[in-house]
Interface confidence: low
């Protein structure tokens, strides 16, 4: 028979729990063996004090009786031949030599019937407290402090953990978080990051990725100061932060045992999310302007937001939905997080400026509005946060209320009358088509353009092929030539303030077709861009190149 207890001495700390195992091998008799525990105190090394027994409930000496009854000292059977002695709260007078004795069930006395191990009780000298993580922000004079950090900002917390245990021990320090106002216990405390006794840094499951990305850092500064930095705070980082220090000692058998643990509340942390703060307003209110006038709209981004820079960035854009159109509309212009402006599709050729006029005020300016610019405008702001890395993450976006913009129509009415000079034209001659334009309304400086189009008959009928441009004169007076069916020379010109002429030289049979004149009225804006204010289409003019009698 052999009774086995741990190799000693064991060092444990007053006030903490201790477990001492005992098992028996090589015995005869029933599989379920009984165990008796005794203590020999240093001041009376020959006196065995009965602690607890698996067989006799009255076994305990007076010094242990009340603690055994209270369940503070107990023997717990692991299996028939193994038990563990558990003492819930060690006292200084619990130091001494513990003996585990197994009453004999053997046919003859053989081997050892007890094992002894010394337990030494160390004073509780582990200290844990909050330490300022560096320069402190504005904190209410509460204990623990209440801290508010902006989303995307760094959250830094410090912890002081020290021990003056005379034995060689290691400290493990971890930072944990519990949801605000939750009771603190192992089940509610979620580990954020910790330094093990071997100085390895480990993060709790939800934080491992951030530790690997360098967004979560934990370092030891000096002998007893630990600092955790959470880069790029997120809404889920809000809560009560704790620091837990555990003191470990290496037992003679080489295994490590935790001999003390203490926890301190560091701070109640609120994370002010950008989505809860970001607000966008627009001004100056409903706008009514004439065509060609500048349109200026202001967008103000407000809220308790961190300034743009290291941890936060903002982009601001304007969207426009034509009157009556659903949805947010199309992008007009935007400033990205770097302050670089760009125009939306369809606005590229326009004189449009988007600029930051104050720290949080942005202005959209269309140098010369057009009737097509009428609609509802919204300002869209996006807030981004940057963690420890350089990549930005969109954290919030907000749209302003719609701001209606009305642009008066030009009110230009055009009419066009076209005809073939001379009425009849022969092959080889020149056909002259004239177009007279009349204009009603419109601003001063209105310019006219006119183009000539032809539809050619196929098998005696007008084809379904769209009309082809033959030629025209633009609002700037520049002639543009298209394709003449017969391939001969074409000339287009302005022959009066409201009269345009198309000439088809050396007519051939391929020039047969139905021609029309399409005038358009144009307004030039202050930004030198042109806006089409009106258009019309003349009636059809048939050109049929007759053959001279000699041609037959």
């Amino acid at each position: 028979r052999e009774v086995l207890v741990p190799e000693g001495p064991l060092y444990r700390v007053a006030g903490t729990a201790v477990s001492i195992s005992c098992n028996v091998t090589g015995y005869e008799g029933p599989a379920q063996q009984n165990f008796e525990w005794f203590l020999y105190r240093p001041e009376a090394p020959d006196t065995a004090l009965g602690i607890v027994s698996t067989k006799d409930t009255q076994f305990s000496y007076a010094v242990f009786k009340s603690r055994v009854v209270a369940g503070e000292v107990q023997v717990q059977r692991l299996q028939g031949d193994a038990v563990v002695l558990k003492i819930a709260r060690l006292q200084a007078q619990d130091a001494g030599i513990y003996e585990c004795h197994t009453p004999s069930t053997d046919t003859r006395y053989l081997g050892s019937y007890s094992g002894k191990v010394e337990l030494r009780v160390l004073p509780d000298v582990l200290q844990v407290s909050a330490a300022p993580p560096g320069p402190r922000g504005r904190q209410a004079p509460t204990s623990p402090p209440r801290m508010t950090v902006h989303e995307g900002q760094e959250l830094a917390l410090g912890c002081l953990a020290r021990t003056s245990t005379q034995k060689h021990t290691h400290l493990a320090v971890s930072f944990g978080r519990s949801v605000p106002e939750a009771p603190v216990g192992r089940s509610t405390l979620q580990e954020v990051v910790g330094i093990r006794s071997d100085l390895a840094v480990e993060a709790g499951a939800p934080y491992a990725e951030r530790l690997a990305a360098g967004e979560l850092r934990l370092g030891k500064e000096g002998t007893d100061r630990y600092r955790m930095v959470v880069g790029g705070a997120q809404a889920g980082d809000a809560g009560t932060y704790h620091c837990t220090a555990a003191e470990w000692i290496q037992d003679p058998d080489g295994s490590w045992a935790q001999i003390a643990e203490k926890r301190a509340v560091l701070a109640h942390v609120d994370v002010q999310t950008l989505s809860s703060q970001l607000a966008v307003t627009v001004g100056p209110g409903e706008r009514r302007i004439g065509p060609g006038e500048p349109l200026e709209l202001l967008c103000n981004v407000s809220g308790a937001l961190p300034p743009a820079g290291r941890h936060a960035a903002y982009s601001v854009g304007w969207e426009m939905a034509p009157a009556g159109a659903p949805g947010p509309g199309r992008l007009v212009a935007q400033l990205d997080t770097e302050g670089v402006g760009s125009l939306g599709p369809g606005y590229e050729g326009r004189h449009i400026a988007m600029e930051k006029v104050a720290s949080r005020t942005y202005r959209l300016r269309l140098e010369a509005a057009r009737p097509g610019d009428a609609g509802t405008y919204r300002c869209l702001a996006k807030a981004y946060v940057r963690g420890s890395g350089t990549r930005l993450r969109e954290a919030a976006s907000a749209r302003s209320r719609p701001l209606p913009v009305h642009v008066r129509e030009e009110g230009v009415v055009l009419e066009a009358v076209a005809w073939l000079a001379g009425g009849t034209v022969y092959r080889g001659e020149t056909a002259s088509l004239l177009c007279n334009i009349s204009v009603r309304g419109g601003p001063p400086g209105l310019r006219l353009a006119a183009s000539w189009w032809v539809e050619r008959p196929e098998d005696g009928e007008l084809s379904s092929v769209p009309a082809q441009l033959v030629g025209g004169v633009g609002q700037d007076g520049v002639a543009e030539l298209g394709v003449r069916p017969g391939g001969g020379p074409v000339s287009v010109e302005l022959v009066g303030p409201r009269s345009h002429r198309l000439r088809l030289h050396s007519l051939g049979p391929e020039d047969e077709g139905v021609y029309h004149c399409a005038p358009s009225a144009w307004v030039q804006h202050a930004d030198y861009s042109w806006y089409q204010a009106g258009s019309a289409r003349s009636g059809p003019v048939t050109v049929y190149p007759y053959m001279h009698a000699l041609d037959t």
Epitope: P133, G134, P135, R136, G137, R138, V149, Q153, E154, L155, A156, P306, P307, A308, G309, R310, H311, A358, S359, R360, T361
Partner: antibody, heavy 123, light 105 residues
Framework: AVTLDESGGGLQTPGGGLSLVCKAS????????MQWVRQAPGKGLEWVAG????????AYAPAVKGRATISRDNGQSTVRLQLNNLRAEDTGTYYC????????????????WGHGTEVIVSS | ALTQPSSVSANPGETVKITCSGS?????YGWYQQKSPGSAPVTLI????KRPSDIPSRFSGSKSGSTGTLTITGVQADDEAVYFC??????????FGAGTTLTVL
């Protein structure tokens, strides 16, 4: 060249108020955040207050919060620090400082300093 | 406040490093030289490593982790001064270190 000239210092009585003015020249003040920094006799630099480019963001050190008001007039190229309920510990040289950004509220972004104006709070 | 050593000393021509830690806000440091109390500080470095054009290249700045460092390469007698670091806390207010006195032996 960038120049910052502070004025308004001198002997002040405890409980009273003072108004310091910083006049800027050589750059467009409207594009930069401005700050006030002070230095007590024999002591280090202490950040007092900051105001961003258009005056929409202001911040104050805990020692002066509630007693100080920082303001700016970009048209006049001036920045003002009003400090009320003066205490003996407000004694020192007050510097006006220009930052490199429009809005930082950060003492690590200063690129120009004034020569300072001395304030003595004593009865 | 920010943490920086109270004093450092060096022989002429040597390299000196002054550290500054504790910025819980932006994490961006500036370095300022003051030759005598009451005289205006001079900006040596801003934004961790940017040097104004009129500052000699022997002054340089860097940042590693949460610590900023001012390096003076080839120290000269004229560099004897108090050096302050500045940064921000996490409530967007400025803060300074207590200052480091450089003695050139």
């Amino acid at each position: 060249a960038v120049t910052l000239d502070e004025s308004g210092g001198g002997l002040q009585t405890p409980g009273g108020g003072l108004s310091l003015v910083c006049k800027a020249s050589g750059f467009s003040i409207s594009s930069y955040e401005m700050q006030w920094v002070r230095q007590a006799p024999g002591k280090g630099l202490e950040w007092v207050a900051g105001i961003d480019d258009d005056g929409s963001s202001r911040a104050y050190a805990p020692a002066v919060k509630g007693r100080a008001t920082i303001s700016r007039d970009n048209g006049q190229s001036t920045v003002r620090l009003q400090l009320n309920n003066l205490r003996a510990e407000d004694t020192g040289t007050y510097y006006c400082a220009k930052t490199i950004y429009a809005a930082t509220l950060n003492a690590g972004e200063i690129d120009a300093w004034g020569h300072g104006t001395e304030v003595i709070v004593s009865s | 406040a920010l943490t920086q050593p109270s004093s450092v000393s060096a022989n002429p021509g040597e390299t000196v490093k002054i550290t500054c830690s504790g910025s819980s806000g932006s994490g961006y440091y500036g370095w300022y030289q003051q030759k005598s109390p009451g005289s205006a500080p001079v900006t040596l470095i801003y934004d961790n490593d940017k040097r104004p054009s009129d500052i000699p290249s022997r002054f340089s700045g860097s940042k590693s982790g949460s610590t900023g460092t001012l390096t003076i390469t080839g120290v000269q007698a004229d560099d004897e001064a108090v050096y302050f670091c500045g940064s921000a806390d996490n409530n967007y207010t400025g803060i300074f270190g207590a200052g480091t006195t450089l003695t050139v032996l």
